[in-house]
Amino acid sequence: LQDPCSNCPAGTFCDNNRNQICSPCPPNSFSSAGGQRTCDICRQCKGVFRTRKECSSTSNAECDCTPGFHCLGAGCSMCEQDCKQGQELTKKGCKDCCFGTFNDQKRGICRPWTNCSLDGKSVLVNGTKERDVVCGPSPADLSPGASSVTPPAPAREPGH
């Protein structure tokens, strides 16, 4: 026997009190699938959240964050304060990146500058709070008489 509730479309619930007729979801609620016995309460985008998409009878509201904040978590479950480039968010608010670290975004943490010497390269452009260092050619590549551009090897003909 087919469950009569399976005939109830999205946007309705199967009303057990009324011989399982399909009743429209109450205001501020929705059902995104058919055959539901209750509707779900719409998400309310309040405070630092703002409405990106209104709730409808068949889909939940979607929130994003007011200017100066950015979304965190699945479905923008949290809003976190933006900082400036060159800063990171701490428990005490936005703080400048320490020397030797940088952040080129309004969110996230300060990261250490790239250590060019680990790749055998030299620092071409110094790092700042907002920008990573730019690594240049290795010191050996810059020795007198050395070309900084290696010409391509001549192509070999087949059979040689």
Epitope: P26, P27, C39, D40, I41
Partner: nanobody
Framework: EVQLLESGGGLVQPGGSLRLSCAAS????????VGWVRQAPGKGLEWVSA????????YYAESVKGRFTISRDNAKNTLYLQMSSLRAEDTAVYYC???????????????RGQGTQVTVSS
């Protein structure tokens, strides 16, 4: 026992007005989310208007915005629907309804009254 008794319906000409009343007993209107649903001949139920968030906000269906006004009198435990600029398509049985929030997070509603018939015709 929860009871909802609607009244105030009748026959009215297009462009006319009516005020529906819903006297509630067995619960306190001001502590609930309540509203009006209607059922036109041969059609399904439709939400018309509601007072939500314990009076913090109101809802109106697009088809009645600017023409219908929902209100309540907490002292009389009565819900009202003032209907003006009535149209033929407003013809329906109007029921007073109480939104029910279930422990698991689901939402349904209950309407216990017999409803009141509104007929808009010339």
């Amino acid at each position: 026992e929860v009871q909802l008794l609607e009244s105030g319906g009748g026959l009215v000409q297009p462009g006319g007005s009516l005020r529906l009343s819903c006297a509630a007993s067995g619960f306190t209107l001001s502590a609930e989310d309540v509203g009006w649903v209607r059922q036109a001949p041969g059609k399904g139920l439709e939400w018309v208007s509601a007072i939500l968030d314990h009076g913090g906000s109101t809802y109106y269906a697009e088809s009645v915005k600017g023409r219908f006004t929902i209100s309540r009198d907490n002292a009389k435990n009565t819900l009202y629907l003032q209907m003006s600029s009535l149209r033929a398509e407003d013809t329906a049985v109007y029921y007073c309804a109480r939104v029910i929030y279930h422990a698991g997070g689901g939402v349904t509603y209950d309407y216990r009254g017999q409803g009141t018939q509104v007929t808009v015709s010339s």
